[in-house]
């Protein structure tokens, strides 16, 4: 007998469990940047500190009537969703509220920046336990707001932001577009994207995951025991902030990268109907609904990976796309995808001491995406081996020649523009285990890693008949680190990873032209981490 | 997620004709001016001046003061509303948009962003 949203995000085995840090006290603090709140509400009294921070613009309109309960409505509801006594996700968590939104729910980028700086100052003056910052607000893309989020995240603060309610690409909004924040879209009781009037939840590659955000019952500022239902990506973000608070309460040393990877790994997969999103955004939008993950003690040693898409390169001839992992993550592979199929491949290069995944558009192409596979590999030592393009008709082989290094990904980049000339690359696990094999005019890049107990293998699946895509999945206990398409005669659009599934896409028009003898193959590199074992290549 | 989205970036790197100050004439702006792509969300007249990452505390204050001085020379009054030290070096200023070209040529300035609205979601 609990509301749908709490049932959805908190698995049955967690329902009665109270999360406490090892010393018995819940030291996580959540900072809420929102409207004013009603601190005396039964849901949050004694748990909330209303700071004296107030940086809001004047309300619009000469006849605006400032009514306290309306001014407090949004913030009170969210405070209740995060840490409410009864309707909260992280019931005991202490919360600090900063007023950056006025009675009409409007604020400014500058006010938000001053609020974030206030948190940083508080952190410097009185260092405490883990901090979570909830940003249930959105404005247009702002370089400085994203930069401020990056700076705060690098001090160890976990920021959670609303994706936005504009039924649009979340990358066009801030702070939703900041890579260092956990960006949350909204789903309803049927696990479908939330519609809000003519608009709805934002989507796209800048969304990390979705969470309940429709008809969420929480504290109402109308009275100190009142409840009401509210909807939006703010509510969704508040659920994730609550989950993060609970995770940190159990394990205060979890980093942002670990938190994000665990949220993604343990979320409910493939329940969202992607048809709700614009067609060009469907492949970029994560099909993930948040749930409270078990602790690392219960699930230790798993290799956790996520897929990071770049921005679209744009259509110019030399346009490149760049996908980056978080500083703590290892880039284990890089692939590319183009809707037109006109791409010149992908490669990994070091920029400012960090490995990045790059993809290059081809002449006449509408643009490409770079697709990075970003993983948490404790004590990893990874390097890239590349071989320049072979002479016409010759194969290029690249393997991991350092001792105890295993192949985690392959990338291929063609020097030639003419797609008809080149024979696309192949990855042959049976003939040459642990090698990337390129063909005519392709530079080949092998991503090689050494980490305690890391073992990898290639898994291939080919389809000869007409098919828009070929997929291959890593089996339970293994994690997908690399994904490539090994084509037959047809033009391929590229390959990308969706959770543990490697998806190779083939050009629509090519399906009819295909001869049955030439299969399109999806090649996955699957790895696992067994801390006691030596690094090895599994044939 | 880190590329600039649907965002207006304008170069206002015009060398000043009217200012005879040697250091200013020598400094051609490489800084950019940015503002929200949604016109209705913009707050013209309020700007966040973002300085280079390594700018020291004293230099932030000097840059803000220098902008005030140079604006005054042109007959403009500007108001520094807030100085950012802890998350990034910079300051928030209320001024006429006429002064953007001048501000972009100040030493240490990386970019200037026009303030804009954010909304409860």
């Amino acid at each position: 007998s609990i509301p749908w949203n709490l049932e959805r995000i908190i698995p049955a085995w967690h329902q009665t469990e109270e999360d406490r840090s090892p010393d018995g006290s819940s030291q996580v603090e959540v900072y809420l940047l929102d409207t004013s709140i009603q601190g005396a509400h039964r849901e949050i009294e004694g748990r909330v500190t209303i700071t004296d921070f107030n940086s809001v613009p004047e309300e619009d309109g000469t006849r605006f009537h400032r009514q306290a309960s309306k001014c407090d409505s949004h913030g009170t509801h969210l405070a209740g969703v995060v840490s409410g006594r009864d309707a909260g996700v992280a019931k005991g968590t202490s919360l600090h509220s900063l007023r950056v939104l006025n009675c009409q729910g409007k604020g400014t980028v500058s006010g938000t920046l001053i609020g974030l700086e206030f948190i940083r100052k508080s952190q410097l003056i009185q260092p405490s336990g883990p901090l979570v910052v909830l940003l249930p607000l959105a404005g247009g893309y702002s370089r400085i707001l994203n930069a401020a989020c990056r700076h705060l995240a690098r001090t160890g603060v976990v920021l959670v932001a609303a994706a936005g309610n504009f039924r649009d690409d979340a990358c066009l909004y801030s702070p939703a577009s900041a890579p260092e924040v956990i960006t949350v879209g909204a789903t309803n009781a049927q696990d479908q994207p939330v519609t809000l009037g003519t608009l709805g939840t934002n989507f796209g590659r800048c969304v990390d995951l979705f969470a309940p955000g429709k008809d969420i019952i929480g504290a109402s500022s109308d009275c100190s025991t009142c409840f009401m239902s509210q909807s939006g990506t703010s509510q969704a973000a508040a659920h994730v902030a609550g989950i993060v608070a609970r995770m940190l309460s159990r394990e205060p040393t979890l980093t942002l990268a670990e938190l994000r990877q665990r949220l993604i790994h343990f979320s409910t997969k493939d329940v969202i109907n992607m048809a709700w999103f614009p067609e060009d955004q469907q492949v970029l939008t994560p099909n993930l609904v948040a749930t409270l993950p078990p602790s690392t003690h219960e699930t230790g040693g798993q290799l956790l990976c996520r897929t990071v898409w770049s921005a679209h390169s744009g259509p110019t001839r030399t346009a490149t796309a760049t996908a980056r992992c978080a500083p703590e993550e290892e880039l284990l592979s890089c692939s590319s995808f183009s809707r037109s199929g006109r791409r010149r491949g992908d490669w990994i290069e070091a920029i400012g001491g960090q490995q990045v995944c790059k993809a290059l558009n081809a002449f006449g192409g509408e643009g490409v995406y770079a697709v990075a596979r970003c993983c948490l590999v404790p004590r990893a030592n990874c390097s890239i081996h590349n071989t320049p393009a072979a002479r016409a008709g010759l194969e290029t082989h690249v393997h991991c020649h350092q001792k105890d290094h295993v192949l985690t990904g392959c990338s291929f980049h063609w020097e030639v523009e003419d797609l008809s000339v080149r024979r696309q690359p192949a990855l042959r696990s049976r003939r040459q285990p642990g090698q990337c094999v390129g063909h005519q005019a392709a530079s080949v890049y092998a991503s090689c890693c050494h980490a305690p107990g890391l073992e990898c293998k290639i898994k291939e699946h080919g389809i000869s008949g007409p098919s828009e895509q070929v997929t291959v999945a890593c089996e339970a206990g293994w994690t997908l680190t690399g994904c490539n398409v090994l084509p037959g005669a047809s033009l391929t659009l590229g390959a990308y990873s969706v959770d543990n599934l490697c998806v190779a896409r083939v050009h629509d028009t090519a399906r009819a032209d295909r001869t049955s003898g030439e299969a399109t193959v999806a090649a996955a590199i699957c790895c696992r981490s067994r801390p006691s074992a030596k690094a090895s290549w599994v044939q | 997620q880190d590329e600039d989205g649907d965002y207006e970036e304008l170069m206002l790197a015009l060398p000043s004709q009217e200012d005879g100050l040697a250091d200013e004439a020598a400094h051609v702006a490489t800084a950019t001016f940015r503002r929200c792509s949604k016109e209705a969300w913009r707050l013209p007249g309020t700007y966040i001046v973002v300085l280079m990452e390594e700018t020291q505390r004293l230099q932030i204050e000097q840059t803000a003061h220098r902008l005030q001085t140079r604006a005054a020379r042109r007959g403009y009054v500007i108001k520094v509303l807030h100085i950012f030290y802890d998350l990034f070096p910079g300051f928030l200023v209320k001024m006429s948009s006429d002064l953007l070209g001048l501000a972009l040529k100040l030493p240490h300035v990386e970019y200037i962003e026009e303030d804009s609205f954010v909304f409860a979601q």
């Epitope: 609990i2 005396a40 009294e45 009864d86 109402s220 009275c223 100190s224 025991t225 009142c226 409840f227 | -």
Partner: antibody, heavy 123, light 107 residues
Framework: EVQLQQSGPELVKPGASVKISCKAS????????MNWVKQSHGKSLEWIGD????????SYNQKFKGKATLTVDKSSSTAYMELRSLTSEDSAVYYC????????????????WGQGTTLTVSS | DIQMTQTTSSLSASLGDRVTISCSAS??????LNWYQQKPDGTVKLLIY???SLHSGVPSRFSGSGSGTDYSLTISNLEPEDIATYYC?????????FGSGTKLEIK
């Protein structure tokens, strides 16, 4: 039929503690907050606090913090109030009262009341 | 805490009369007000919630009204079983507070 059956009258000495029970029947125990109300002889009603039977979450009237402790036992659909360091001021009739749970968010009242438990503190 | 005041501590009326009991709050409570009936044997029942909503099973002769700080309970046609003490209670702000009660007697 909904019933809140309270434990019988108590006569206790000053300084002692007492635990009053309230057994619920005829409805789903976790669907209602359990409130406790004090009525001193010939006086009005005073709200002591409430408890959510789902998770044991409590709210107290500041006046009774440290005096009253509210608990529930879901398995027996019973709510308890313990009063400690008793003085003659604590002599009163104590009521338990069920009020609509939060996710029925239009319900902010005490629908059902127990018959009351008389507590006498005397040496 | 919000103080609830019932100025009339006792009230005598005849059967069939229309009786109004008033209650005022020390600050605006936005209609977050309930009325309870306590019989001489101590039994307590909810009559009206949220200023004017009749609780299920309560006779329609009971009605409530008011706004801001001033509220009232009306019994349109007094019956013998209505002999009781009536309490108003606010839930706008914690702690919940009750009025001092109005004792209704038959003339």
């Amino acid at each position: 039929e909904v019933q809140l059956q309270q434990s019988g009258p108590e006569l206790v000495k000053p300084g002692a503690s007492v635990k009053i029970s309230c057994k619920a029947s005829g409805y789903t125990f976790t669907d209602y907050y359990m409130n406790w109300v004090k009525q001193s002889h010939g006086k009005s009603l005073e709200w002591i606090g409430d408890i959510n039977p789902n998770n044991g979450g409590t709210s107290y009237n500041q006046k009774f913090k440290g005096k009253a402790t509210l608990t529930v036992d879901k398995s027996s659909s019973t709510a308890y109030m313990e009063l400690r360091s008793l003085t003659s001021e604590d002599s009163a009739v104590y009521y338990c009262a069920g009020g609509g749970i939060y996710y029925r968010y239009d319900r902010n009242y005490f629908d059902y009341w127990g018959q009351g438990t008389t507590l006498t503190v005397s040496s | 805490d919000i103080q609830m005041t019932q100025t009339t501590s006792s009230l005598s009326a005849s059967l069939g009369d229309r009786v109004t009991i008033s209650c005022s709050a020390s600050q605006g409570i936005s209609n977050y007000l309930n009325w309870y009936q306590q019989k001489p044997d101590g039994t307590v029942k909810l009559l009206i919630y949220y200023t004017s909503s009749l609780h299920s099973g309560v006779p329609s002769r009971f009605s409530g009204s008011g706004s801001g700080t001033d509220y009232s309970l009306t019994i349109s046609n007094l019956e013998p079983e209505d002999i009781a003490t009536y309490y108003c209670q606010q839930y706008s702000k914690l702690p919940f507070t009750f009025g001092s009660g109005t004792k209704l007697e038959i003339k």
